[in-house]
Amino acid sequence: RKIPKVGHTFFQKPESCPPVPGGSMKLDIGIINENQRVSMSRNIESRSTSPWNYTVTWDPNRYPSEVVQAQCRNLGCINAQGKEDISMNSVPIQQETLVVRRKHQGCSVSFQLEKVLVTVGCTCVTPVIHHVQ
Amino acid sequence: GITIPRNPGCPNSEDKNFPRTVMVNLNIHNRNTNTNPKRSSDYYNRSTSPWNLHRNEDPERYPSVIWEAKCRHLGCINADGNVDYHMNSVPIQQEILVLRREPPHCPNSFRLEKILVSVGCTCVTPIVHHVA
């Protein structure tokens, strides 16, 4: 999947664009908004009717090296009595993000952009019932 | 990908940190995941905390289209299909990395940007505040 170039209908390429070898692109990995702190909801992963746990995956050849993945705790959902209700389903909600992958080839290193699918949390849904003839 | 010579001390001396600027291949390695959540699942309609999906488009960003979730209700849908205000629909938010064209409008020069997106909604028991 190639990153689409900006169409001429939108913009003219500025003169100030840096020279880039063919088939590649320049990527500054100093993250914009790196230090922004967002007020996230307090421990919704344990207060949800479809609660989830977090696992941290670590890979030194990936940037960022730490990616957090959620896993739904139950197949069903938690009812008002605190019991699992298997007539409902806990399902994962996923979102794509970009990472930079470092690959070693002998004494050379190359960098590749990669899309990673992150499970962000879980939600409780009514199941789809398939009626078998 | 684009190869870059390692340090003269290769293979013993390895820089564990990523350089500030890298040259990367224009092809993105992925699993060909479907980026339109409306097509990939109907959880947004079937959830007890349903949400709407809003298209956010920015030609200076890759991906240029990101779908933002907005919870439909303040409460959650109960077994009778009514909104139960004793529970709360809350957004599940995630920080993701995208590419920002830098300098602006340049076709092959980008910087990583961290953005906060609401991916979906989940139903939670509210935090009850007891006022003294």
Epitope: S39, R42, R47 | C71, R72, H73, L74, N88, I127
Partner: nanobody, 125 residues
């Protein structure tokens, strides 16, 4: 930062109607629920109404249900409180409020981080 500015408050006869707009600027206000509160002289500030992020759902205090309606126009970054069948006891300063996270009940005052300066509504009998 979110800046909120309420307007539309004035003297109105009992049984009359008013529409209070609340214009938001700064951080995108569409990301979280918005609320209206009111404070009568010598009384605590109290919850009036709240609207969900999507605008598809709203919640109301019992004393205004059926008379007041909250709505939002994300294109204009504005939340409205439509007030009908006004009573003298609705006399108060009406405040618009925004929240930056949503993890508790929608009617709890401390969950709202940003407040407007208020607009005075007086209902005469």
């Amino acid at each position: 930062e979110v800046q909120l500015v309420e307007s539309g408050g004035r003297l109105v006869q009992a049984g009359g109607s008013l529409r209070l707009p609340c214009a938001a600027s700064g951080r995108t206000f569409t990301s979280y629920p918005m609320g209206w509160f009111r404070q009568a002289p010598g009384k605590e500030r109290e919850f009036v109404a709240a609207i969900s992020m999507s605008g598809d759902d709203a919640a109301y205090a019992d004393f205004v249900r059926g008379r007041f309606t909250i709505s939002r126009d994300d294109a204009r970054n504005t939340v409205y409180l439509h007030m009908t069948s006004l009573k003298p006891e609705d006399t108060a300063v009406y405040y618009c409020a925004a929240r930056t996270s949503y993890d508790g009940t929608y009617d709890y005052i401390d969950d709202y981080s940003y407040w407007g300066q208020g607009t005075q509504v007086t209902v005469s009998s």
